[in-house]
Amino acid sequence: YKLVCYYTSWSQYREGDGSCFPDALDRFLCTHIIYSFANISNDHIDTWEWNDVTLYGMLNTLKNRNPNLKTLLSVGGWNFGSQRFSKIASNTQSRRTFIKSVPPFLRTHGFDGLDLAWLYPGRRDKQHFTTLIKEMKAEFIKEAQPGKKQLLLSAALSAGKVTIDSSYDIAKISQHLDFISIMTYDFHGAWRGTTGHHSPLFRGQEDASPDRFSNTDYAVGYMLRLGAPASKLVMGIPTFGRSFTLASSETGVGAPISGPGIPGRFTKEAGTLAYYEICDFLRGATVHRILGQQVPYATKGNQWVGYDDQESVKSKVQYLKDRQLAGAMVWALDLDDFQGSFCGQDLRFPLTNAIKDALAAT
C-alpha cells in the first residue's frame, strides 16, 4: 500500500515546538512525501518561499538512507488560487511553457514527481484540467526516454460531490495519473452553523441531502463509480481537527455554534487544530465517539473539536483495504505530533504511524 504524506513549507514558521523542518521527518514512515507548495510565475514552475530550495534539499536527503522513498512537489494550493491555474491551463502556449518547465525543475531539485493541487477547477476548467494532466504525462514519458526513471504525476482532488461533478472528468484523468489523492476531510465547517465532524468515515444517522454526500464512504464510492481505478485511489486522512465555538449548552453533533473554534497555540488558525494541539486540548476534555461515523469529537467549555485518533484511522485503513484502494494519504506530517512530545506516547508521528501499522497489518 502507498502511504502518501504531505509536508507543508509554512510549518517552518510556527513558533517553538510547532516549527517543523523536513529534516525532522521520518524517512521510513511514508512511501511518498509531497512537499507543499510550489508556485507558478511567468508560466514556469517556481519556488514559493525563497528558502524552498534549502527545504527541498533537506527533504530529498531523506532518500539517501531510504532509496525506496519517493518525493513529489505539489504545485498550487489554496493561496495560489483557481483563477491563476485556469489562465495557464486554458491557454495553449502558457500550458506548454508550464509543462516544459516542470521536468528540469523536478530533476534539479531531486524530486521524483509532481502533484497537481488545483483547488479547484471550475465548470469551464474541467476539459482544461484533463488536457493539462494528459499533456503533462506525455511530457514526462518523453522526458524519460533517454533511460531516466519516469517522473510520477499525481493530483489532489476534492471529495465534495458538487466539486467532483463540476471539476473533474474522473475516468479520463485517471488514465494519466499515477495516483489520485482524494481529500476526504473538510466535509463540515463553521459555515454550516452547527457542529459536525469534518472527516466522518460513514454517513451520520441524521444526515439528510446534501449531508448524505459529506462522508468518506460516499466520496470514495462515487469516485470509483465515475471510473477511478481503486488501484490508483489514495484516501485522505487528516492529522488535524476542525473546531467550533458552541452557542448554547448543547454539545452533541448538530449543536448550534457561534463560529469557528479558538485558534491553536501553534497553528493560530481559527477553527483548526493540529493533532498535537488536540492532545493538549484533550486534557480535561470530554471525548465522545460518533459511532456510525466511526470518528471522535471532544468538548471542553464552549469548544468542540472533531478529529481523528489512532482508533479512527485504523477503521479508515480497514475500510480502504476492504475497498482495495491504493493506500492512504495524510495531510499533513507537520500537524501530527512530529516531535512525539505532546501526545504522551513517546512516539513521533503517532497518527501516521498508526496508519502505517494498519496498512501493514494482515
Partner: antibody, heavy 117, light 107 residues
C-alpha cells in the same frame, strides 16, 4: 562545475549608470534564484538584490530600491543588475551568487564598481 | 530590518584551538541563519546554512547551532587555512542582512 563570471564594472561618475552581467554555467540556471551582494572597500557584506528562477519575484535592499533593477535571461544563462543614479556609497565589489534557497552557495569572483567624479 | 550582531569582532587564536563565534538576531529568525568564510581578495564561501547544516565539501570541524535569536559557529580545531573573516547572515526575511564580521587572526 558551477561557474559565475561577473563583468561590467568600472569607473562611473555620480548620477551615472552601469549594467553588470553575470554569466552562469555548470547548473540548471532557470531552476535557481540568484542574488547580488556587494562589499565596499574594507567593509562587510551587504545584500543588494535577488530574483527567482522564473523572474517572477524580485527583492531589493532599501538602499538601492528604485535605482537598481535585477533581471535575468534564462535562455542566455545570464543575470543582470542595471544600476542607475549611482552614488559614491555604491562603490563596492559586486558579487553575483547562486541562491541555494536563501543562502548563497556559489559566488563569482566579483567586479569592482567605483563611483567618483 | 533584522539586525545581526556578531561577537567578537576579532579574535586571536592558535592552530588546534577551539573557536566559537556568536551571532544574535534582533528578532526570532527560526533556523534561517547562514555562515560564510571570506579570505582577503576572495569571494565569500558558504560554510553552514539553516543554522546547523554543513555545506557540501566543508570540513566537519565547522559546526553551527542555535535557533530563534542566538546562534553559534564553532571550529573544533583551528587549522592554518581557517584564518579568515566569518560572517553570519539571516535569511528569514528580506532584506537579508549580514553581521559585521569576525576576523580570526593568528595569535
Amino acid at each position: 562545475e558551477v561557474q559565475l563570471v561577473e563583468s561590467g564594472g568600472g569607473l562611473v561618475q555620480p548620477g551615472g549608470s552601469l549594467r553588470l552581467s553575470c554569466a552562469a554555467s555548470g547548473f540548471t540556471f532557470s531552476s535557481y534564484a540568484m542574488s547580488w551582494v556587494r562589499q565596499a572597500p574594507g567593509k562587510g557584506l551587504e545584500w543588494v538584490s535577488a530574483i527567482s528562477g522564473s523572474s517572477g519575484s524580485t527583492y531589493y535592499a532599501d538602499s538601492v530600491k528604485g535605482r537598481f533593477t535585477i533581471s535575468r535571461d534564462n535562455s542566455k544563462n545570464t543575470l543582470y543588475l542595471q544600476m542607475n543614479s549611482l552614488r559614491a556609497e555604491d562603490t563596492a565589489v559586486y558579487y553575483c551568487a547562486k541562491a541555494q534557497g536563501t543562502s548563497a552557495d556559489f559566488w563569482g569572483q566579483g567586479t569592482l564598481v567605483t563611483v567618483s567624479s | 530590518d533584522i539586525q545581526m550582531t556578531q561577537s567578537p569582532s576579532s579574535l586571536s587564536a592558535s592552530v588546534g584551538d577551539r573557536v566559537t563565534i556568536t551571532c544574535r538576531a534582533s528578532q526570532s529568525i527560526s533556523r534561517w541563519l547562514n555562515w560564510y568564510q571570506q579570505k582577503p581578495g576572495k569571494a565569500p564561501k558558504l560554510l553552514i546554512y539553516a543554522a546547523s547544516r554543513l555545506q557540501s565539501g566543508v570540513p566537519s570541524r565547522f559546526s553551527g547551532s542555535g535557533s530563534g535569536t542566538d546562534f553559534t559557529l564553532t571550529i573544533s580545531s583551528l587549522q592554518p587555512e581557517d584564518f579568515a573573516t566569518y560572517y553570519c547572515q539571516q535569511s528569514y526575511s528580506t532584506p537579508w542582512t549580514f553581521g559585521q564580521g569576525t576576523k580570526v587572526e593568528i595569535k
